[in-house]
């Protein structure tokens, strides 16, 4: 297993609709054709694999399971969007990138993006 640098923004504020987007960029040492990206959330004394995607370079990301994530790739950048977030989901979201093929296997883990989620204020009752 060889180490690889992964960069991601330090802080992102989710939209009022509970959507947060950030870029995960990795310094690929070679010409990887198969890449796996995992988003981990570290907060509340938990480590959760939020979503994971495997993609072939140049193709769309295919997320596994009931994913709350979507994303696109462009070169060594992955644009990730996490949906359905609530205030209690605020935490450190870490981007983990694995170059699966061809060998050698490379692993990179970012420092994390602190995502802040603020639940929208309920609309006041209206007489209209």
């Amino acid at each position: 297993c060889k180490a690889m640098h992964v960069a991601q923004p330090a802080v992102v504020l989710a939209s009022s609709r509970g959507i947060a987007s950030f870029v995960c960029e990795y310094a690929s040492p070679g010409k990887a054709t198969e890449v796996r990206v995992t988003v981990l959330r570290q907060a509340d004394s938990q480590v959760t694999e939020v979503c994971a995607a495997t993609y072939m370079m140049g193709n769309e990301l295919t997320f596994l399971d009931d994913s709350i994530c979507t994303g696109t790739s462009s070169g060594n950048q992955v644009n990730l969007t996490i949906q359905g977030l609530r205030a209690m989901d605020t935490g450190l979201y870490i981007c983990k990138v694995e170059l699966m093929y061809p060998p050698p296997y490379y692993l990179g883990i970012g420092n994390g993006t602190q995502i802040y989620v603020i639940d929208p204020e309920p609309c006041p009752d209206s007489d209209f």
Epitope: Q46, T48, V50, L64, D65, D66, M88, D89, G91, Y93
Partner: nanobody, 124 residues
Amino acid sequence: EVQLVESGGGLVQAGGSLGLSCAASGRSFSMYAMGWFRTAPGKEREFVAAISGSGTLTSYADSVKGRFAISRDNAKNTVYLRMNNLNAEDTAVYYCAARSGWGAAMRSADFRSWGQGTQVTVSS
């Protein structure tokens, strides 16, 4: 809704291992994320581990990461919790729970179906 029955609890010495099982009855087991929670004497219910519908995603409490492993067999409608290197702080009633869909954080309020629990006692 899914009905859940836990098994495998018991008395084990500190440093030992134990395996819990949770059998689910009902349809579409693979549509549910499954979790384990525990309640220790005098403490609130605590998240332990969870696994997504197809078993590709997991979540662990910091206190058990590296010692406990969650897995599932969708063909058998069963979720498992393998517990290694147990210590006295792991003594609790362990509950299996189910929720629809996955999430960024694991909270008991998001789990709608619960088993009756199985007692795990670690003696030192």
